[in-house]
């Protein structure tokens, strides 16, 4: 007996071939001997089976002695043995229909779990193997679960169902809802405008939800909400914003925030959360602000940074085109009695400059000028 695997919702074509290459009488029946379809001369006739409106054939092949049974919009319950009667002989085909579905929405938040459920006909014993977009293989029986979804799990999952040495392949598109970056850091000189961007790692036609940016300033004892906003069909509208600082927010995606001035009291880290409509849980992105200030007070040239810096970052003061006068893994450095000229304050990581501020030291009789 020939075995054919089909997919729920798909179309399957069961073949039946006569030795004579011409149109002759044929009938397709199910295991209960109920006629599905056949022919009367060159006319297609249909029987009383429940497949009636979903069964068809190809008249174009009859003249070549081929009498296919086409079943459209397959259902699991179409799994059966189908019998083709032609030329006083019977051809039997066993059809097994499988379905594979994500038992939740296919749009899942980062960190959530994905469960794939296999629908199969009674008496079958299929095995399933799925390959994620990043090449990770998972195996299972009727259900397969993947916990802690990551951004790289977004894309097409290819699942192969094996039964009777035959296989059928399913493709399921999974979208992991997340920000492109889990964390970002912005380095700014005091007084500069600060731009925070929160690009999403997915695109959907309609995006609705609400969000908030909580900020923990380095100098503050507790965090505070800087801004709350709504998102409706990818349009952003601000609900509430603090007076200090007075953030501005872009009206379109990607989410974009502007801080008019980088000041030491704003240095710190924030957490932007986005709650999407019809989703449990929230998307998170951490954002950090490091602010640098270079000053000269009387005979003391000082460079300071505020905000979350790693211990391996180096803070240096140097006269232009000369060796660093002072270099420390600290958040403040200074030079006493600095000689006149253009001084540079540098924050660097393994030789790569992250932030620099220049200050001009004038001869002792005049006041310093900050460019």
């Amino acid at each position: 007996k020939k075995v054919v695997l089909g997919k729920k919702g798909d179309t399957v074509e069961l073949t039946c071939t006569a030795s004579q290459k011409k149109s002759i009488q044929f009938h397709w029946k199910n295991s209960n001997q109920i006629k599905i379809l056949g022919n009367q001369g060159s006319f297609l006739t249909k029987g009383p089976s429940k497949l009636n409106d979903r069964a068809d054939s190809r008249r174009s092949l009859w003249d070549q002695g081929n009498f296919p049974l086409i079943i459209k919009n397959l259902k699991i319950e179409d799994s059966d043995t189908y019998i083709c009667e032609v030329e006083d002989q019977k051809e039997e085909v066993q059809l097994l229909v499988f379905g594979l579905t994500a038992n939740s929405d296919t749009h899942l938040l980062q960190g959530q779990s994905l469960t794939l459920t296999l629908e199969s006909p009674p008496g079958s014993s299929p095995s399933v193997q799925c390959r994620s977009p990043r090449g990770k293989n998972i195996q299972g029986g009727k259900t397969l679960s993947v916990s802690q979804l990551e951004l790289q799990d977004s894309g097409t999952w290819t699942c192969t169902v094996l039964q009777n040495q035959k296989k059928v392949e399913f493709k399921i598109d999974i979208v992991v809802l997340a920000f492109q970056k889990a964390s970002s850091i912005v380095y700014k000189k005091e007084g500069e405008q600060v731009e925070f961007s929160f690009p999403l790692a997915f695109t959907v036609e309609k995006l609705t939800g609400s969000g908030e940016l909580w900020w923990q300033a380095e100098r503050a004892s507790s965090s505070k909400s800087w801004i709350t906003f709504d998102l409706k069909n990818k349009e952003v509208s601000v609900k509430r914003v603090t007076q200090d600082p007075k953030l501005q927010m872009g009206k379109k995606l990607p989410l974009h925030l502007t801080l008019p001035q980088a000041l030491p009291q704003y240095a710190g880290s924030g957490n932007l959360t986005l709650a999407l409509e019809a989703k449990t849980g929230k998307l998170h992105q951490e954002v950090n602000l490091v602010v640098m200030r270079a000053t000269q007070l009387q005979k003391n040239l000082t460079c300071e940074v505020w905000g979350p810096t790693s211990p391996k970052l180096m803070l240096s003061l140097k006269l232009e085109n000369k060796e660093a006068k002072v270099s420390k893994r600290e958040k403040a450095v200074w030079v006493l009695n600095p000689e006149a000229g253009m001084w540079q304050c540098l924050l660097s990581d393994s030789g790569q400059v992250l932030l620099e501020s220049n200050i001009k030291v004038l001869p002792t009789w005049s006041t310093p000028v900050q460019p």
Partner: antibody, heavy 118, light 107 residues
Framework: EVQLVESGGGLVKPGGSLRLSCAAS????????MHWVRQAPGKGLEWVSA????????YYADSVKGRFTISRDDSKNTLYLQMNSLKTEDTAVYYC???????????WGRGTLVTVSS | DIQMTQSPSSLSASVGDRVTITCRAS??????LAWYQQKPGKAPKLLIY???TLESGVPSRFSGSGSGTDFTLTISSLQPEDFATYYC?????????FGGGTKVEIK
């Protein structure tokens, strides 16, 4: 998105060869028969070739039999038409079309223009 | 080969008119027939299959009838977007064949 996108058309001299491709997406390509249909400039539609879902059987119009070969690669969701010994009368927009079963075309590509001229 | 003959080859009509296009097969083809609509520079679009079954998403003003050798496509009330060329196609035997087309123009 359910779609078919043809490519590979262009200008070729009589007697030359060309291979057309049709990339399918958004549906179960392997379970559908596929067809090529052409349309000469300012003229009607002409069926060219068909291939069964499993790729075992193919069918051709008399005008292209022996010169054209239809094939499919289900792993790439792609349909092909290898056109050899091209004639000026093969000049047309070539469409790939999905078979609704039986032999009705419910999804078409935008077409690719093949010009056979010396 | 089965020849499909459409008539008329072109017609002029106004919005709101009832339009009938006929298709004749050179031999009996039972109900193995489809109708397509094609607009300039676009791919054809399936309207009706199995002679009278309306494809999903196609407006109900389109209808098909006939069996054997004579078939009809009717547009009950012509709309501006219906001005196009219409083709019939038989699925009775290979080679599959199309009618020559009927161009529906604005009067």
């Amino acid at each position: 998105e359910v779609q078919l996108v043809e490519s590979g058309g262009g200008l070729v001299k009589p007697g030359g060869s060309l291979r057309l491709s049709c990339a399918a997406s958004g549906f179960a390509f392997s379970s559908h028969w596929m067809h090529w249909v052409r349309q000469a400039p300012g003229k009607g539609l002409e069926w060219v070739s068909a291939i069964s879902g499993n790729g075992d059987n193919s069918y051709y119009a008399d005008s292209v039999k022996g010169r054209f070969t239809i094939s499919r690669d289900d792993s790439k969701n792609t349909l092909y038409l290898q056109m050899n010994s091209l004639k000026t009368e093969d000049t047309a927009v070539y469409y790939c079309a999905r078979d609704r079963a039986p032999e009705y075309f419910d999804l078409w590509g935008r077409g690719t223009l093949v010009t056979v001229s010396s | 080969d089965i020849q499909m003959t459409q008539s008329p080859s072109s017609l002029s009509a106004s919005v709101g008119d009832r339009v009938t296009i006929t298709c004749r097969a050179s031999q009996g083809i039972d109900s193995w027939l489809a109708w397509y609509q094609q607009k300039p520079g676009k791919a054809p679009k399936l309207l009706i299959y199995a002679a009278s079954t309306l494809e999903s998403g196609v407006p109900s003003r389109f209808s098909g009838s006939g069996s054997g050798t004579d078939f009809t496509l009717t547009i009950s009330s012509l709309q501006p977007e219906d001005f196009a060329t219409y083709y019939c196609q038989q699925a009775y035997s290979f080679p599959l064949t199309f009618g020559g087309g009927t161009k529906v123009e604005i009067k």
